[in-house]
């Protein structure tokens, strides 16, 4: 019988509010034994896969997706999914990357540290929670 795969988690370092031109790293975490982590942006059809998986703890593996110089086009909702043979997991919650213009330059520390995706309120008519997706480092391909 196939095991029930836990949903992955997603976080962003140094945070989810990133000054223009600074770097951000998305961290996807799942159980041990993950073969591939996938970072999806806006739609399942736009994603980046990596098999560069490391062990974060005895029970957890992780992969890191870095954007070196964030542009406005990188803002948006991201989520993770992983493949642990023989099946894919469910998706993590979405994590929104916000890109802000800053006069402080690329090393400005004006970020939200250690942000990760958590429970979200059901959208109401006043919650508009989608932002511009990334164009850098993600590819549009047929999914799965």
């Amino acid at each position: 019988q196939e095991e029930d795969l836990p949903r992955p988690s997603i976080s962003a370092e140094p945070g989810t509010v990133i000054p223009l031109g600074s770097h951000v790293t998305f961290v996807c975490r799942g159980p041990v034994g993950v073969q591939t982590f996938r970072l999806e942006r806006e739609s399942r059809s736009t994603y980046n896969d990596t098999e560069d998986v490391s062990q974060a703890s005895p029970s957890e593996s992780e992969a890191r997706f870095r954007i070196d110089s964030v542009s406005e086009g990188n803002a948006g909702p991201y989520r993770c999914i992983y493949y642990k043979p023989p099946k894919w997991s469910e998706q993590s919650d979405y994590l929104e990357l916000l890109v802000k213009e800053t006069s402080g330059g690329p090393d400005s520390p004006d970020t939200e540290p250690g942000s990760s995706a958590g429970p979200t309120q059901r959208p109401s008519d006043n919650s508009h929670n989608e932002h511009a997706p990334a164009s850098q480092g993600l590819k549009a391909e047929h999914l799965y």
């Epitope: 806006e42 998706q91 059901r122 008519d125 929670n129 989608e130 932002h131 999914l143 799965y144």
Partner: antibody, heavy 119, light 107 residues
Amino acid sequence: EQSVESGGGLVQPEGSLTLTCKASGFDFSRNAICWVRQAPGKGPEWIACYSFSSSATYYASWAKSRFTISKTSSTTVTLQMTSLTAADTATYFCARVDIYGGSRYWGMWGPGTLVTISS
Amino acid sequence: ELVMTQTPASVEAAVGGTVTIKCQASQNIGGDLAWYQQKPGQPPKLLIYRASTLESGVPSRFSGSGSGTEFTLTISDLECADAATYYCQDTDIGSGAFGGGTELEIK
């Protein structure tokens, strides 16, 4: 707060038509708007989506050549349809799509606008 | 292109009974699935999203389960007002495909 479709009506075969989805009481700024149609007695059929934040457009494969989804303002999205045939006769709905957790939430649908293709 | 296959096409059940509707995706869609109820002359009404999350205001008699490619909608303690057509949908904005529908008749 709602979204309302307009622009439907009777069109001759091979004609063109532009439908409008207008937000009332909010703007679409950080949402996606999607068009779905439903022929009489049939099920809903996804046509296209427009992401306000990324300006990305997404189409069903059958719709790419004759349908164009676009933003005309922060509160309106249009669907341009060309080379219409009787098979395009349907009620056309627009839906506002949010994000909830790790999934999309198609929670707000307009009442629909009827498009009839006939000579 | 993703295809959503829904079964059965129609079902008849008694008041107070339970029905199960199945939806199969041709590719893995994770939890990107919604269920709708539709009555004549109305737009689809969202019942369940993210495969199993009940929309606000929808009775708990409606429940959804599944992930990946196999999904189920269960309606228990059936009422006359449940007579309608039910659809599943891939909620990804790059796909959006609907199932063919299940017509529920209450006797």
